[in-house]
């Protein structure tokens, strides 16, 4: 807190300009009006101050505003968004994705702090909706920003914005993510052919139902078994070794490697024998031949 | 991101030396840079500026004339050349720096001892 001192004659700021790196923290806190200050805020991300002058700026234009900064002033805050708290960024009404991406670059390369989760917060919620444009906006700056919302606030993303989303957004989604975000690809893609189609659902597979993988095996796809490894274990274990081969085509050999781990593993145990023998991998742990094989959850659904 | 100055050290009264502030991580090509400096005891004082295309430079009154701050974008560095030192001019000097959008890097600081 810089001590209230009158400002010595001469030095009253007629403008934000380089020469106020010359005054001490009480010159400033004496000599630089908040208006002023607030209407050139620009200029201050072109002048080298240090820290502590930054902090009493910050100071000057709390103290014009209580209840929250104006978004013209809030746009042109450079540096000093990353001395905001959240509490103060809380109080903030910010509607321009254009502010967005001033205050996002000033935390460029950094992790995702408190500050700018709040700023994103404030944002989409009054937006209504997580659009198209601002996800672009978020996902080029946080690759990993989709599978930061919970499935309830990714519920709110239109099927539309889905088209921002690269392979890379969804690297570190749990499989409850990818529920909610899977269906909304296979409705913004659904008019895409065949081969074009399989390249955008991708990476949202982790997401997919036994019927849609079913549909798929008749495709001629030859999923990775990268992508194979991320498909739910409940949507895996009723295909068929036939429907498995037509889903993996010539990458069906990768299975081999992966037969000690989920969901190939557990889809092992539950085909025959037989059946496993027939794709020539040396697959073993399927159900022995004469065997037979009791659905009990149809048998309680029936009862 | 950081800034690094360098070339400090002790010096009698009237002599001469340079300070060089170099980036690391990053290059310094589109940041304006200040010069400051901190006597023991005292608050922090500006005492140069240079702007980024080095077109436009600022002196503190107590320096005019004998501190020329200048750079060489070729080599990434802000030079601060301070002659005719005066016991006064004691104190640790830093080097801060400003980007686009406002980002912001300072230096850990080099010290100047005239006695």
């Known amino acids: 807190e810089v001590e209230k001192t009158a400002c010595p004659s001469g030095k009253k700021a007629r403008e934000i300009d380089e020469s106020l790196i010359f005054y001490k923290k009480w010159e400033l806190e004496a000599c630089v009006d908040a208006a002023l200050l607030a209407t050139q805020m620009d200029r201050v991300n072109a002048i080298p101050f240090t820290y502590e002058q930054l902090d009493v700026l910050k100071h000057k234009l709390d103290e014009l505003y209580p209840q929250g900064y104006p978004e013209s002033v809030i746009q042109h805050l450079g540096y000093l968004f990353l001395k905001m708290s959240p509490e103060d960024i809380r109080k903030w009404n910010v509607t321009s994705l254009e502010t967005l991406k001033a205050l996002l670059e000033v935390n460029k390369g950094h992790e995702m702090s408190p500050q700018v989760a709040t700023l994103i917060d404030r944002f989409v919620k009054g937006r209504g909706q997580l659009d198209k444009d601002t996800l672009d906006t978020l996902t080029a700056f946080y690759p990993g920003y989709l599978c930061s919302l919970s499935p309830e606030e990714l519920s709110s993303v239109p099927p539309s914005s889905i088209w921002a989303v690269r392979p890379q957004d969804l690297d570190t989604c749990d499989p409850r993510q990818l529920d909610v975000l899977y269906p909304k690809a296979r409705l913004a893609f659904q008019n895409m052919n065949g081969s074009e189609y399989f390249v955008k659902i991708q990476s949202f597979l982790g997401g997919a139902p036994t019927e849609d993988l079913k549909a798929l095996s008749q495709q001629n796809v030859s999923m990775d078994l990268a992508t194979f490894m991320k498909l739910r274990t409940d949507a895996v274990l009723p295909l068929t070794v036939a429907e498995v081969q037509k889903l993996l085509g010539p990458h069906v050999e990768g299975l081999k490697a992966e037969e000690r781990h989920r969901p190939v593993r557990d889809w092992i145990l539950r085909q025959r024998q037989d059946d496993l023998d027939t794709l020539g991998l040396g697959l073993q742990g399927g159900i022995p031949n004469g065997y037979l094989v009791l659905d009990l959850s149809m048998q309680e659904a029936l009862s | 991101l950081q800034l690094v100055e360098s070339g400090g050290g002790l010096v009698q009264p009237g002599g001469s030396l340079r300070l060089s502030c170099a980036a690391s991580?990053?290059?310094?090509?589109?940041?304006?840079i200040g010069w400051f400096r901190q006597a023991p005891g005292k608050e922090r004082e500006g005492v140069s500026s240079i702007s980024s295309s080095g077109g436009s430079t600022n002196y503190a009154d107590s320096v005019k004339g004998r501190f020329t701050v200048s750079r060489d974008n070729a080599k990434h560095t802000v030079y601060l050349q301070m002659n005719s030192l005066k016991p006064e001019d004691t104190a640790v000097y830093y080097c801060?720096?400003?980007?686009?959008?406002?980002?912001?890097?300072m230096g850990q600081g080099t010290s100047v001892t005239v006695s």
């Open positions: 801060a720096g400003v980007g686009d959008y406002g980002r912001r890097v």
């Open positions: 991580g990053f290059t310094l090509d589109n940041y304006a």
